[in-house]
Amino acid sequence: KFSKQSWGLENEALIVRCPRQGKSSYIVDWYYSQTNKSIPTQERNRVFASGQLLKFLPAEVADSGIYTCIVRSPTFNRTGYANVTIYKKQPDCNVPDYLMYSTVSGSEKNSKIYCPTIDLYNWTAPLEWFKNCQALQGSRYKAHKSFLVIDNVMTDDAGDYTCKFIHNENGANYSVTATRSFTVKDEQGFSRFPVIRAPAHNETKEVEIGENTNLTCSACFGKGAQFLATVQWQLNGNKITDFSEPRIQQEEGQNQSFSNGLACVNTVLRIADVKEEDLLLRYDCLALNLHGLRRHTIRLSRKNPIDHQSTYC
């Protein structure tokens, strides 16, 4: 259940995170699952445990197997399993499927390729990038932090992209490579200044005290895949996360929809058990992309009690 596949190449660094790790600072013990033998924490060992991380510096084919991690607390131990496979380096350029990370797709307007697993390593820029084993050269390719951006993506940019970087551990350097496929969606898209579909600017919504209500912030940003397009709610000019009122929550994740070919994004603000003080707040729907920011404000008002009374005597 709490198991994660990890893989690497012999003579490269491999760092694996415990699948059960939630918060930092908890004690994590690592074991070889087959023998129940504890993995040492001393860094002089080629394979050693470092808190939530298990480090193979460098990895060997014989390291393949299942490793157990236990996140320890006096009242709640939590166990996870790392299924590690180390492969021999391929003599030719071909990268087999079992060494591939998840495929990403892009378009003319969105061509980010993230280097998989890089956040686990102590690396310094720049990353080296290869396509089908050829080093990428030219002004179209920009290695930015942990990802590659390709300008003016074309269909023949599809292929297998490998990132290569150096992991540094106590002054010693180890090479790491990771490969993923990139596919190109052929679509003529465009981006424009955000248009907010809902709410209308300076709208007022009637609500009942004690009831739940939802506010939808919906905006369109152009056609096709968008490089940056986000919508969010603010309360009195503050982020929802900075507003310590658990009754008011912005739904996690944003729903993307394509309306008449337009790329539209919406997010819902859920207000549970509406209170009098909620009527005093200013609710701002913000839509942001590379062209700029648009804001629509909505306020809540108390539903007129007469609405609930029968017109018949």
Epitope: S25, I27, V71, S73, P74, T75, F76
Partner: antibody, heavy 117, light 111 residues
Framework: DVQLQQSGPGLVKPSQSLSLTCTVT?????????WDWIRQFPGNKLEWMGY???????YYNPSLKSRISITRDTSKNQFFLQLNSVTTEDTATYYC??????????WGQGTSVTVSS | DIVLTQSPASLTVSLGQRATISCRAS??????????MHWYQQKPGQPPKLLIY???NLESGVPARFSGSGSGTDFTLNIHPVEEEDAATYYC?????????FGAGTKLELK
């Protein structure tokens, strides 16, 4: 994000059972974590009552062990508190919460329960 | 059961000043290099909110003006500089053994 919504009666008669429901959205209660009940007495004192882990194991506060039962309905992603033989001393605000390791990371909105005839 | 004693029961601090809250456990809550003491903030009409876990680790999203320290039986929550929104009741909680218990709370008011 994990969200917890509580429901249940606000008034219970002495010697009867108190039953509360906590409905979880945004996370499956069988995936991980422990799912707690905590109460806060009128003087603001907090008491951990017990929890049910993702595996179904339960842990109770010994001070309540003979009267408390925490169960779940995995199909509805709900967990429940039942406290038997209540007295006026059980008047409190009852919270459900999520324990990831040792701390209650997400809380329900709280349900005020009065025990009175 | 491990009893947690908080002091003071209430304190009044000026904006921008330091607030210090103590929590003493009836027996050690530290073991194997970690201290299983945590701090929460509660505002009226709201559930408690986790601030600090394992004595000194700041929970994600909590402002850096909150800090925790201590080991064994003596723990401290510091808030500096105190801001208006910090007016609340603060609780310590241990997880060294069952049952988990809380302190009685410290009410922080602003001058």
């Amino acid at each position: 994000d994990v969200q917890l919504q509580q429901s249940g009666p606000g008034l219970v008669k002495p010697s009867q059972s108190l039953s509360l429901t906590c409905t979880v959205t945004g996370y499956s209660i069988t995936s991980d974590y422990a799912w707690d009940w905590i109460r806060q007495f009128p003087g603001n004192k907090l008491e951990w009552m017990g929890y049910i882990r993702y595996s179904g194991d339960t842990y109770y506060n010994p001070s309540l062990k003979s009267r408390i039962s925490i169960t779940r309905d995995t199909s509805k992603n709900q967990f429940f508190l039942q406290l038997n033989s209540v007295t006026t001393e059980d008047t409190a605000t009852y919270y459900c919460a999520t324990t990831m390791m040792d701390t209650m990371d997400y809380w329900g909105q709280g349900t005020s329960v009065t025990v009175s005839s | 059961d491990i009893v947690l004693t908080q002091s003071p029961a209430s304190l009044t601090v000026s904006l921008g000043q330091r607030a210090t809250i103590s929590c003493r456990a009836s027996k050690s809550v530290s073991t194997s290099g970690n201290s299983y003491m945590h701090w929460y903030q509660q505002k009226p009409g709201q559930p408690p909110k986790l601030l600090i876990y394992l004595a000194s680790n700041l929970e994600s999203g909590v402002p850096a003006r909150f800090s925790g320290s201590g080991s064994g039986t003596d723990f401290t929550l510091n808030i500096h500089p105190v801001e208006e929104e910090d007016a609340a009741t603060y609780y310590c909680q241990h997880s060294r053994e069952f049952p988990l218990t809380f302190g009685a709370g410290t009410k922080l008011e602003l001058k």
